[in-house]
């Protein structure tokens, strides 16, 4: 707490400007007003304050607003958010994309703090969902955030926002949250035609069921082998050798590089060798010929 | 050793095809797909197409489509390239190579088109 | 098409020097489920074919001297020789077989004093 001490003569402010930089802390606590701190805010980023100079700042509106900032004041803050604990954010009400943007360039370049962490959950919260508009801006500050939600999270995100998903959002994904995000990806990309559709829903095949790995074999759509590669397990298994050689077409020749990684290998032991031998790779490990496969999870349905 | 033997030169004239040879040796035909790329003088290398020589698949560079025609003979461990309609732009040195990484390159046949 | 882009197009360097040369690819080529990344280097001495040296960006071919050292990841790769021979005189391509067409760098001439 900085003690109350009367402001010398001649030194109360008038304006925020640069002459504030050689107050001491208490004679900026005695001459500077609030109200007056409060309309100017947008003046403080352009003094270079020292780091006790800003806290007094701060201590000054939190004395004029103890229920938290007006988005006003909010808007401008500047470097002062830096100074804002996850508690004082949450008294706050962000309701504007531009106070989002304003705060988010703060702290531009560094890891997700948890005072941005705090702001992006009240402006979230306060819009009801994850519309395109916010996403884009999420995103384009922070390329991990889409996967930093919990598949319960996702959930809110409706499929018009979707189309603001760039591949290297999805980078640091978890399958449970492509199970999330493919069936809105799905449905925001139906209209497209064959080719296009195959681009726009490339990032989101790791939540594909093997239905639709199965169709998209049938378009021709030439899957590189490290999106193969991220495919749900369970997905892949069921494809036959036929399925997969046309899903990849002439990636499918990569398939013998990546044979001892899943979900490659345990494809690789589900299916006969005679078929893994039309690849043309040498690949080994299949069912061999004249076995009889059984299917014991059928058989336990059926008892 | 692994080996793709191709013919050292073919002199064709503009407008006709000519169908270029690479026989393998000392490996298993259909345990590698087969890629063919062409180099003109003094210029990069081009990747022209694969052929899967189990099945005969065959994948191509859009841009040699209408020009390269990928075939294989499993009985000769042959693979086969025609290249059809010469032009100039057709004169380079075609190679053929083996697998995903190109591990063994063939030693290559001189393509001259001239009247 | 992933286009790759190598750097310097020639250099010159006396026998027992070290020598640096870069590719960059328009795109990643790192498979992030299995870590490697689909890059490969060739040598190709004059009047010969292309030999491979190199692939995944960093797993040396049999039979290549240690010598040679492929590094990088992403879309920024380096070979180096540690120290140049005089039978190394060649170009050296990079090669993505990340997705099809297959696109090669347009080479390095490595000229030797």
């Known amino acids: 707490e900085v003690e109350k001490t009367a402001c010398p003569s001649g030194k109360k402010a008038r304006e925020i400007d640069e002459s504030l930089i050689f107050y001491k802390k208490w004679e900026l606590e005695a001459c500077v007003d609030a109200a007056l701190l409060a309309t100017q805010m947008d003046r403080v980023n352009a003094i270079p304050f020292t780091y006790e100079q800003l806290d007094v700042l701060k201590h000054k509106l939190d004395e004029l607003y103890p229920q938290g900032y007006p988005e006003s004041v909010i808007q401008h803050l500047g470097y002062l958010f830096l100074k804002m604990s996850p508690e004082d954010i949450r008294k706050w009400n962000v309701t504007s994309l531009e106070t989002l943007k304003a705060l988010l360039e703060v702290n531009k370049g560094h890891e997700m703090s948890p005072q941005v962490a705090t702001l992006i959950d009240r402006f979230v919260k306060g819009r009801g969902q994850l519309d395109k508009d916010t996403l884009d801006t999420l995103t384009a500050f922070y390329p991990g955030y889409l996967c930093s939600l919990s598949p319960e999270e996702l959930s809110s995100v409706p499929p018009s926002s979707i189309w603001a998903v760039r591949p290297q959002d999805l980078d640091t994904c978890d399958p449970r949250q492509l199970d999330v995000l493919y069936p809105k990806a799905r449905l925001a990309f139906q209209n497209m035609n064959g080719s296009e559709y195959f681009v726009k829903i490339q990032s989101f095949l790791g939540g594909a069921p093997t239905e639709d790995l199965k169709a998209l074999s049938q378009q021709n759509v030439s899957m590189d082998l490290a999106t193969f590669m991220k495919l749900r397990t369970d997905a892949v298994l069921p494809l036959t050798v036929a399925e997969v050689q046309k899903l990849l077409g002439p990636h499918v020749e990569g398939l013998k590089a990546e044979e001892r990684h899943r979900p490659v290998r345990d494809w690789i032991l589900r299916q006969r060798q005679d078929d893994l031998d039309t690849l043309g790779l040498g690949l080994q490990g299949g069912i061999p010929n004249g076995y009889l496969v059984l299917d014991l999870s059928m058989q336990e349905a059926l008892s | 050793q692994v080996q793709l033997q191709q013919p050292g030169t073919e002199l064709v004239k503009p407008g006709a095809s000519v169908k270029l040879s690479c026989k393998a040796s000392d490996y298993t035909f259909t345990s590698y797909w087969m890629h063919w790329v062409k180099q003109r003088p003094g210029q990069g290398l081009e990747w022209i197409g694969s052929?899967?020589?189990?099945?005969?698949?065959?994948y191509y560079n859009e841009k040699f489509k209408n020009k390269a025609t990928l075939t294989v003979d499993k009985s000769s461990s042959t693979a086969y390239m025609q290249l059809s309609s010469l032009t100039s732009d057709d004169s380079a040195v075609y190679y053929c190579a083996r697998g995903w990484y190109f591990d063994v390159w063939g030693t290559g046949t001189t393509v001259t088109v001239s009247s | 098409d992933i286009v790759m882009t190598q750097s310097p197009s020639s250099l010159t360097v006396s026998v027992g020097q070290k020598v640096t040369m870069s590719c960059k690819s328009s795109?990643?080529?790192?498979?992030?489920?299995?870590?490697?990344?689909?890059l490969a280097w060739y040598q190709q001495k004059p009047g010969q074919s292309p030999k491979l040296l190199v692939y995944f960006a960093s797993t040396r071919e049999s039979g290549v001297p240690d010598r040679f050292i492929g590094s990088g990841s992403g879309t920024d790769f380096t070979l180096i020789i540690s120290s140049v021979q005089a039978e190394d005189l060649a170009d050296y391509f990079c090669q993505q077989h990340y997705s099809t067409p297959r696109t090669f760098g347009g080479g390095t001439k490595l000229e030797i004093i």
């Open positions: 795109q990643s080529l790192l498979n992030s489920s299995s870590q490697k990344n689909y």
């Open positions: 052929i899967n020589p189990s099945n005969g698949d065959t």
